[in-house]
Interface confidence: low
């Protein structure tokens, strides 16, 4: 199950996020917006729009494209909400053959970092939290690992 971080946790520094993103076992770091949620047997599928790419692995998804995250139904600690934005960092995607091309599915497993990325900048705590997220995004985007 994914590691859902506490919402608006100001104790998480930009450096902590960068250290996580730059771990060798972490293949990607994305900012995403959840567009739909479907339950299929023992799995929950989240379709998401890829808003920003900070790190990418073998599965080279494109900005603004649709990607899929998958988790076990039993993973109740990592409930993503439709319409919300998240910073998600995790291991390499699973490559699924689809027609004559490949699709990538990102498993939300124990290695996955999931953090709510608020859109609202009006509350002071949101602003300070967004500043930390922006600092992480800027650093990894501009400097890399």
């Amino acid at each position: 199950c994914g590691q859902m971080q506490e919402e608006l946790d100001l104790t998480i520094s930009a450096e902590t996020r960068k250290q996580t993103a730059c771990k060798p076992e972490i293949a990607y770091a994305y900012k995403v917006s959840i567009t739909s949620i479907t339950v299929e047997n023992v799995f929950v599928k989240y379709k998401a729009t890829l808003l920003d790419i900070y790190k990418t692995g073998e599965a080279v998804a494109e900005k603004d494209s649709e990607i899929t995250f998958i988790k076990k139904v039993t993973c109740t600690n990592a409930e993503l909400v439709k319409g919300r934005q998240y910073l998600i960092m995790g291991k390499e995607a699973l490559q699924i053959k689809y027609n004559f091309s490949f699709r990538y599915i990102y498993p939300l497993d124990s290695l996955t970092w999931i953090e709510y990325w608020p859109r609202d900048t009006t509350c002071s705590s949101c602003q300070a939290f967004l500043a930390n997220l922006d600092e992480f995004a800027e650093d990894i985007f501009l400097n890399g690992c």
Partner: antibody, heavy 118, light 109 residues
């Protein structure tokens, strides 16, 4: 009310050193990246350095290796250690707060003047 | 590094008349990373516009910013006496450097 007050400027000989301070108030200092910008007499603005809330630093090529940008979040203070000063470092030095959206400077201090001359 | 070239270097405008300042970048700049500042005589710079077109808090609506790519413009719809000073554009680049334009001096005719 956001306030930035620089101090520490003065006259220094070429090759000398100086430490500038910027006392910040009216906002959560540790949440913001801070910068130093200078303005030579009658000239335009030149970015000197930036420091993130957690202490990552970035420098203009013209000062790299000579200037050190630092901060003490417990004291709400930004510092600029200037070594090996040259005549071309003569300027008004402003400290500025970087906006939460990280590409602009939304508040500036009144500046402190550094004169490098023999 | 990106070089920002402002034009004109100076302009004199009648009170109540419009003014326009251009900022041209040597290579494409993200609109999110372009800002404008005003520096009145004897004062420190003040943020006017960020993100190429968003007015900073407390900035009168006679100031507007526009542009994308390499060409950006600051417009003052009706110049007032308090608008006298030097105007600077500024960008933030991917190599973590902040660059300012050379400045445009605005005077009242």
């Amino acid at each position: 009310e956001v306030q930035l007050v620089e101090s520490g400027g003065g006259l220094v000989q070429p090759g000398g050193s100086l430490i500038l301070s910027c006392a910040a108030s009216g906002f959560t200092f540790s949440s913001y990246a801070m910068t130093w910008v200078r303005q030579a007499p009658g000239k335009g603005l030149e970015w000197v350095c930036a420091i993130s809330g957690s202490g990552s630093t970035y420098y203009a090529d013209s000062v790299k290796g000579r200037f050190t940008c630092s901060r003490d979040n417990s004291k709400n203070t930004l510092y600029l250690q200037m070594n090996s000063l040259r005549a071309e470092d003569t300027a008004v030095y402003y400290c500025a707060r970087r906006g939460l959206r990280y590409n602009y400077f939304d508040y500036w201090g009144a500046g402190t003047t550094v004169t490098v001359s023999s | 590094d990106v070089v920002l070239t402002q034009s004109p270097l100076s302009l004199a405008v009648l009170l109540g008349q419009p003014a326009s300042i251009s900022c041209r970048a040597s290579q494409s700049v993200s609109s999110s990373y372009l800002a404008w500042y005003q520096q009145r005589p004897g004062q420190s710079p003040r943020l006017l516009i960020y993100g190429a077109s968003s007015r900073a808090t407390g900035v009168p609506d006679r100031f507007s910013g526009s542009g994308s790519g390499t060409d950006f413009t600051l417009k003052i719809s009706r110049v007032e006496a308090e608008d006298v000073g030097v105007y600077f554009c500024q960008q933030y680049g991917r190599s973590l450097e902040y660059t300012f334009g050379g400045g445009t001096k605005l005077e009242i005719k």
